[in-house]
Interface confidence: low
């Protein structure tokens, strides 16, 4: 969902603009830039919404069917854990948990970008929250996993294995309350805004352009920025210790949680480049041209459509790079299916390094 | 109630400067792009000014630019026109008007329109 | 700068009458807006997005057109609906106005 989608005439204030190019009467797609910033009325987005007509519907179903089973399948196996779940673990049940809330969301946008909102304004504002409590919470705990990695590996505290369990539902506690906190603008400013241009309803922001603006740099540092500096100085430094120390299982062991995060990296850098580029011309340090903001449209939902795939992209990193979640899930799936023949399934090592499926810890690991 | 009061009309002579006040009330006046448009006795109308909600952008049609200054204070609710090298057919009657507001988004129309200050420009 | 014309410039009509105003573009736009004015006020927006009727704005009044060629029409014309009425323009800069057409009582 991108929730910037916006009326076709816009005075778009970067601040407004009826006004921020050169284009002709006809409308064409003029890469002409004004040195006067404002000799024209606002840029016609036709363009832009009739391709998310076309291509966000069918995205958003299909990542919501596939979120959906992705991440069912990930809680299940967590769940079905009889001894009590790791630090890492906990955080990816949790990720796994903000990633299912997110793509629940997703048919809502969809019928969004397909027809109209047709939820109302209550269900505007929970679902515009839901899908951004959800998005930062996804990148802060895979920060989280990946400090509490650095806390393991690099200076063998284990903050949270030795000390009271509380202490990662705390910290988990502390993303959602943060995440809720970032959220808040969602509450306020989001409803259902009758478009008498398109002569639909929409779900969208109603506030000052510099609000706006606000709101995207924080998206884009507290929500990704932010995460991606902790996840990178912290992996590089467990991957320095790890070659430093020839650990070769203790390497494999990482492999799932860099994957990971090289997965978060890829799946929403496009789309914080395409917000970057949007800033910038709200800031007027890139002069906005129709060309130019039509191709921005577009790119942000294309870009945000990959950034969402990421919500299904970690099942199915578990399911080919994480060796104990392919067990697990089998054994799961064995249950399930045959509940009289459980001497049918390979029982588990008993051995304490079994004990998740994620870790990487002097007292746990797995050769994943 | 929307409101929007236009003062600072008047008498003045060929070159001579003015400047026009509209006071804005009724609905948050930092979020509206506001423009002047003027009409001569007897005449049309003919837009004059826009400036953005935050005062960054401004935009005159050849008639007025280079002469008239469009404005505003967001702190006193207030947009201004100043109009110097004032000629003849300058002479209208001044309306301020807000552009009304979709979706976080501005339309150039205008939904809203103060009574209008004369200006006559005479000498 | 596009500009508007509208016709006629003056229209006498009775109540009852139904009444088409024109307003015609120099080159096309996408969407006009009217705007109804009584003698010494300020105008009033009365159509949108060339078909939308504005806030209080009774439905005998109706707009259309697209293109070059735009048009106004009041079914049944009521006594206060003599007033002069603009058509306008914002698909190019600068917006312009029409010239006005004055509906005037036979």
């Known amino acids: 969902m991108v929730l910037e989608v916006s009326d076709h005439q816009v005075l778009n204030d970067a601040e407004v603009a009826a006004l921020l190019e050169n284009f002709s009467s006809s409308y064409d797609y003029g890469e002409n830039e004004s040195d006067s910033c404002c000799t024209s009325p606002p840029c016609p987005q036709d363009f832009s919404l009739n391709f998310d007509r076309a291509f966000l519907p069918a995205l958003y179903s299909l990542l919501f069917l596939l979120g959906l089973l992705g991440n069912g399948a990930v809680a299940a196996v967590l769940l079905s854990r009889r001894t009590a779940l790791s630090s890492t673990d906990t955080f990816l049940l949790h990720l796994a948990v903000a990633d299912t809330l997110l793509v629940l969301t997703l048919p809502l946008w969809a019928v969004d970008a397909a027809v109209q909102w047709v939820f109302g304004s209550g269900l505007c504002k929970v679902a515009g929250a839901l899908f951004n409590i959800n998005f930062y919470a996804g990148a802060l705990l895979l920060a989280c996993i990946s400090f509490d990695r650095y806390l393991n590996i690099v200076h063998a505290t284990q903050l949270y294995r030795r000390g009271p369990p509380a202490r990662v539902t705390l910290t988990c506690l502390a993303v959602w309350g943060l995440c809720l906190l970032f959220a808040l603008p969602d509450f306020i400013f989001l409803s259902a805004h009758h478009d008498e241009r398109l002569n639909a309803t929409h779900c969208q922001y109603n506030f000052p352009q510099v609000g706006r603006t606000a709101l995207r740099v924080l998206q884009l540092v507290a929500g990704f920025l932010l995460p991606l500096l902790v996840m990178a100085y912290c992996y590089a430094h467990i991957l320095a210790v790890l070659l430093v120390s020839r650990g070769q299982r203790r390497l494999r062991a990482m492999r799932l949680v860099v994957v990971v995060v090289v997965a978060f990296a890829l799946c929403w850098t496009p789309y914080h480049l395409v917000v970057l580029v949007d800033i910038l011309m709200d800031l007027g340090a890139l002069a906005r041209n129709c060309g130019r903001e039509s191709r921005v449209d577009v790119a942000k939902s294309v870009t945000s459509g990959l950034g969402y795939m990421h919500c299904c992209l970690n099942p199915l990193l578990y399911a080919f790079v994480g060796v104990k979640f392919r067990e697990r899930m089998w054994m799961l799936l064995l249950r399930l299916g045959c509940p009289n023949q459980r001497g049918l399934q390979r029982q588990p090592s008993s051995s304490r390094r079994d004990s998740s499926w994620s870790e990487t810890s002097e007292a746990s690991y797995s050769g994943l | 109630e929307v409101q929007l009061l236009e003062s600072g009309g008047g008498l003045v002579q060929p070159g001579g400067s003015l400047r026009l006040s509209c006071a804005a009330s009724?609905?948050?006046?930092?979020?509206?792009?506001m423009s002047w448009v003027r009409q001569a006795p007897g005449k049309g109308l003919e837009w004059v000014a826009v400036?953005?909600?935050?005062?960054?952008?401004?935009y005159y049609p050849d008639s007025v630019k280079g002469r008239f200054t469009i404005s505003r204070d967001n702190a006193k609710n207030t947009l201004y026109l100043q109009m110097n090298s004032l000629r003849a057919e300058d002479t209208a009657m001044y309306y301020c008007?807000?552009?009304?507001?979709?979706?976080?988004?501005?339309?150039?129309?205008?939904?809203?329109w103060g009574q209008g200050t004369l200006v006559t420009v005479s000498s | 700068d596009i500009q508007l014309t509208q016709s006629p410039s003056f229209l006498s009509a009775s109540v009852g009458d139904r009444v088409t105003i024109t307003c015609r573009a120099s080159?096309?736009?996408?969407?006009i807006y009217w705007y109804q004015q009584k003698p010494g006020k300020a105008p009033k927006l009365w159509i949108y997005?060339?078909?939308n009727l504005a806030p209080g704005v009774p439905s005998r009044f109706s707009g259309s057109g697209s293109g070059n060629e735009y048009t106004l029409t009041i079914s049944s014309l009521q006594p206060e609906d003599f007033a002069t009425y603009y058509c306008?323009?914002?698909?190019?800069?600068?917006?312009?106005f029409g010239g006005g057409t004055k509906l005037e009582i036979k």
């Open positions: 008007a807000r552009h009304p507001i979709y979706s976080g988004n501005y339309q150039g129309y205008f939904d809203y």
């Open positions: 009724g609905f948050t006046f930092t979020s509206y792009a």
């Open positions: 400036i953005s909600h935050g005062g960054t952008y401004t």
């Open positions: 080159s096309g736009v996408n969407y």
């Open positions: 997005f060339t078909s």
């Open positions: 306008q323009q914002f698909t190019s800069s600068p917006y312009t």
